[in-house]
Amino acid sequence: CKAMHVAQPAVVLASSRGIASFVCEYASPGKATEVRVTVLRQADSQVTEVCAATYMMGNELTFLDDSICTGTSSGNQVNLTIQGLRAMDTGLYICKVELMYPPPYYLGIGNGTQIYVIDPEPCPDSDF
């Protein structure tokens, strides 16, 4: 048994369309068949769930239809994309990985990715 390490980038800049992508990688200490990945947002000392998905190893990771997240998985790496971000959503986004099955359960928590979101300037009216 070893503690599970989760790695994620320190900083990501969202695109002008409010889309941010980052990789969440975990060092699996066991042979998990069922993995749950959760994106948490930490503001001050408050932690809220942004989105979560459970997937079977070797299968694709599926978020709920109304989720603002999409993602793909490859081995012990998950590529996460968060959409619809605005400047007020700038903050620390933590990747949480849980090895759900088979036992034992493992919890791994990343240090967080600071996502910066800049709202695009509205286009000025052009007189042509």
Epitope: C1, K2, A3, M4, H5, E34, R36, T38, L40, V47, T48, E49, A52, I94, K96, E98, M100, Y101, P103, P104, Y105, Y106, L107, G108, I109
Partner: antibody, heavy 118, light 108 residues
Amino acid sequence: QVQLVESGGGVVQPGRSLRLSCAASGFTFSSHGMHWVRQAPGKGLEWVAVTWYDGSNKHYADSVKGRATISRDNSKNTLYLQMNSLRAEDTAVYYCTRGELLGYFDYWGQGTLVTVSS
Amino acid sequence: EIVLTQSPGTLSLSPGERATLSCRASQSVSSSCLAWYQQKPGQAPRLLIYGASSRATGIPDRFSGSGSGTDFTLTISRLEPEDFAVYYCQQYGISPFTFGPGTKVDIK
């Protein structure tokens, strides 16, 4: 505000069964792992079991494996612990506790006392 | 399973003194997954520290946590009368989730 209220404790004879309940309110129940932790009189804390999110995954302490079943009803915001083949060493205060999103146990119920005695 | 050992078993101190409580794990624990709880007689445990060093909401800053790997410490900088209680460390990174046996801080 978050509230956890346990019920179902009491005096029960060895070999019999008991079902404990924990009514939760003030948070999104299905987003949290929910645990039972027990404490024998004058002793320390012992983790008993957890049920995760939709209830499909559960884990147990060796001391209760095969005798305990943890379950949850997300539509009723209620956590359960069914204990069978009770032994004297199961005598304890049973606490229901919430796993915070980062994993630690942030809210605890007041506890319900189970006494196994003939 | 990860076994947590706490020392000392009992700490006898006076109000205003500094308390240093130790928690040692039988194998490496992620510092993200180590918590400290306080329990007073007849009450449920109360979360003090999570992630080895983060104070829970409403916990006074005289409580601090530190450590990594297998060695963790809870420090109470100046004991107040209400701090005399039993303190438990816990790891929540690998099931079964385990608690230390506790350290009782009592009045000298």
